[in-house]
Amino acid sequence: EVEKTACPSGKKAREIDESLIFYKKWELEACVDAALLATQMDRVNAIPFTYEQLDVLKHKLDELYPQGYPESVIQHLGYLFLKMSPEDIRKWNVTSLETLKALLEVNKGHEMSPQVATLIDRFVKGRGQLDKDTLDTLTAFYPGYLCSLSPEELSSVPPSSIWAVRPQDLDTCDPRQLDVLYPKARLAFQNMNGSEYFVKIQSFLGGAPTEDLKALSQQNVSMDLATFMKLRTDAVLPLTVAEVQKLLGPHVEGLKAEERHRPVRDWILRQRQDDLDTLGLGLQG
């Protein structure tokens, strides 16, 4: 807390400008009007304030807006956002994607902080669902964002948003998450066909049931090993040797290198040795 002291004569700030960097903390507290600060927040980022000075500015805004900052202020917080606690952010009502982008930009290049996680949570809850534009924005800043959500949270993702998902956005998703995303992807891409469809759905196949894999095995898809290794073990186990051979096409030779890893290892153990021998890869069941 900064003590309440009168502003020295002639030091009353009429605008937020570079002269303020020479103010001591108590002078900032006494001489900068909170309402002025709020209307000129966009100028704060252009001025090289110290962390201690930023603390004072935050304190002034907190006093002016005890129930939480309005979006007009939030959008221009800039580096002052890094001073906010999750508790501060929970008071906010952020509805504009532009505001979200502006604040994510401040944290760019860093891991997702608790502040950012809280901000995103507030934003998504305010929107009611994770729409395509929001997902586009979030995955651009945090490629692992989608996989950080629980299956319950993912269930609120509308199928139309799936178009914004890139393969790398799914790299860290576990089977439970892909179980939720796969039906959404099927719905999103259902009017595509041929190789175009397979390219789009491929990243989501970790949530595919056995029946879909069996159907694909009859359609010359030539699934790569990286995709095969991400399939659900329980979906792969019922596949016959012939089905896996047709599913992988020329990539079937890659099974040898993966024979000790799931789901290949578990699948091999389920097969008759005679059937495995037809592949000519030396796989031992």
Epitope: L187, N193, G194, S195, E211, Q219
Partner: nanobody, 128 residues
Framework: QVQLVESGGGSVQAGGSLRLSCAAS????????MGWFRQAPGKEREGVAS????????YYDDSVKGRFTISRDNAKNTLYLQMNSLKPEDTAMYYC?????????????????????WGQGTQVTVSS
């Protein structure tokens, strides 16, 4: 997963009509195939008619062309087979089936081995 339940079978005189229905529950997508198959006692199961759910493709076996019509009500998630001018040789157990993913419409041809979801069947008996 898709569950298929047929209804509408029964006994009819030659020349009569029947309409079979197949209610699908679970996830049905445009790039799936649905079709009708039949199996007469002592015979192999054979394809009757099939379609691409998203439209643009229907197939009929030569033996039913001009007499049977396959259709689908998307809102009700139901597949139909309208059978007119029935003959005694149409007597069989009729099955509704689906392919869970079709990369091309032509893959929907009613080939038994391609279809991976099946209903329990409904009996159709045509007497002369």
């Amino acid at each position: 997963q898709v569950q298929l339940v047929e209804s509408g079978g029964g006994s009819v005189q030659a020349g009569g009509s029947l309409r079979l229905s197949c209610a699908a529950s679970g996830n049905v997508y445009n790039n799936m195939c649905m079709g009708w198959f039949r199996q007469a006692p002592g015979k192999e199961r054979e394809g009757v008619a099939s379609m691409y759910v998203g439209g643009g493709y229907t197939y009929y076996d030569d033996s039913v062309k001009g007499r049977f019509t396959i259709s689908r009500d998307n809102a009700k998630n139901t597949l139909y087979l309208q059978m007119n001018s029935l003959k005694p040789e149409d007597t069989a157990m009729y099955y509704c089936a689906a392919i869970s993913i079709a990369l091309t419409r032509e893959f929907c041809a009613p080939i038994v081995s391609r279809y991976n979801y099946w209903g329990q069947g409904t009996q159709v008996t045509v007497s002369s």
